[in-house]
């Protein structure tokens, strides 16, 4: 399977909420013998590999923000820790996987990465990730709402295959 980032760039005004999204593509097994681990973290654009560095999102690590669920299930972070930081990650059974960030500040600007680990029990594991940029703006040049820019189909940075 692959992970795609429908939007490579989100430009938002300060104080707004935004939902960053990754989507699983290809043959995603929804059987009972599959478990998905999914998480989010901040990173930087490396010269060779995007998403190599793992930094916290609002002081929450990728461990704090992870979800795990069976192939046929949906999931979301309901723990107080994430919500106290204005964060919620969620996953549906259509392959969409997102993190919502509330009340954005300029400090939230940066590169965000999603990571998905698919565990096929008694068989194998695969891991894939995707990247997207968030720009939080303030002042007269800031948009009134978030503006999203679709990923180009040629943008191999944003799709990794397993």
């Amino acid at each position: 399977f692959k992970v795609a980032t429908p939007y490579s760039l989100y430009v938002c005004p300060e104080g707004q909420n935004v939902t960053l999204t990754c989507r699983l593509l290809g043959p995603v097994d929804k059987g009972h013998d599959v478990t998905f681990y999914k998480t989010w973290y901040r990173s930087s654009r490396g010269e060779v590999q995007t998403c190599s560095e793992r930094r916290p999102i609002r002081n929450l690590t990728f461990q704090d923000l992870h979800l795990h669920h069976g192939g046929h299930q949906a999931a979301n972070t309901s723990h107080d820790l994430a919500q106290r930081h204005g964060l919620e990650s969620a996953s549906d059974h259509h392959g969409n996987f997102s993190i919502t960030m509330r009340n954005l500040t300029l400090l939230d600007s940066g590169l965000y990465c999603c990571l998905v680990v698919e565990i096929r029990h008694h068989h194998s594991e695969h891991r894939v990730h995707g990247a997207m940029e968030l720009q939080v703006q303030t002042g007269k040049d800031a948009p009134s709402n978030c503006v999203v820019y679709p990923s180009s189909s040629q943008d191999s940075e944003n799709i990794t295959a397993a």
Epitope: T35, Y37, T39, Q49, S52, L115, S124, E125, R127
Partner: antibody, heavy 120, light 106 residues
Framework: QLQLQESGPGLVKPSETLSLTCIVS??????????WGWIRQPPGKGLEWIGS???????HYNPSLKSRVTIPVDTSKNQFSLKLSSVTAADSAVYYC????????????WGQGTLVTVSS | DIQMTQSPSSLSASVGDRVTITCQAS??????LTWYQQKPGNAPKLLIY???NLETGVPSRFSGSGSGTDFTFTINSLQPEDVATYFC????????FGGGTKVEIK
């Protein structure tokens, strides 16, 4: 601080079953974010992953050893085991138990290892 | 199975030298590669994960790079305490290890 400790016989006869146990302290084996695995190292040679067990009891095994390996888990005792059947001299090695973080990927905590010799 | 080919199998260098070890995967593994240090009689110790991330507490003279199939591990200024065997391991799929590189002091 998480600690793993291997235990079991140091000498096993050819064709018998090698049985080792890994006792985990300082953390729960039932934690959902981890694999618990076995790796071996023949004297003077490299590392070979044997297999891993997931908190739910599901397993992954090295394809080359799959027919001879089982890794049971006992959450009540916070331990997991290795059973390797029909052993030969080629199975003589230092056997390590280790933890693998699913999201991070590598084996981050290891036992100190136990030497098992297969000989009659 | 993903095969990991590590080279050289052994090397000897002087204190202060820059030491480089390479690891090649038989198929694309993104950056899902780790490096371990193993001293005689001890279990392996995690040094680097995700090809280039230094594990907490590991000296900065150790570094890693690479992506896809080709990876490099570097000791910037070899110290006597770095005498050990170094292993790479991929975790893109079921774990497999490289054959190891024994590092000695001249």
């Amino acid at each position: 601080q998480l600690q793993l400790q291997e235990s079991g016989p140091g000498l096993v006869k050819p064709s018998e079953t090698l049985s080792l146990t890994c006792i985990v302290s300082g953390g729960s084996i039932s934690s959902s974010g981890y694999y618990w695995g076995w790796i071996r190292q023949p004297p003077g040679k490299g590392l070979e992953w044997i297999g891993s067990i997931f908190y739910s009891g599901n397993t992954h095994y090295n394809p080359s050893l799959k027919s001879r390996v089982t890794i049971p888990v006992d959450t009540s005792k916070n331990q997991f085991s290795l059973k390797l059947s029909s052993v030969t001299a080629a199975d003589s090695a230092v056997y390590y138990c280790a933890r693998r973080d699913i999201l991070t990927g590598p084996f981050d905590y290891w036992g100190q290892g136990t030497l098992v010799t297969v000989s009659s | 199975d993903i095969q990991m080919t590590q080279s050289p199998s052994s090397l000897s260098a002087s204190v202060g030298d820059r030491v480089t070890i390479t690891c090649q995967a038989s198929q694309h593994i993104t950056n899902y590669l780790t490096w371990y240090q193993q001293k005689p009689g001890n279990a392996p110790k995690l040094l680097i994960y995700d090809a280039s991330n230094l594990e907490t507490g590991v000296p900065s003279r150790f570094s890693g790079s690479g992506s896809g199939t080709d990876f490099t591990f570097t000791i910037n200024s070899l110290q006597p305490e770095d005498v050990a065997t170094y292993f790479c391991q991929q975790y893109d799929n079921l774990p497999t290890f490289g054959g190891g590189t024994k590092v000695e002091i001249k």
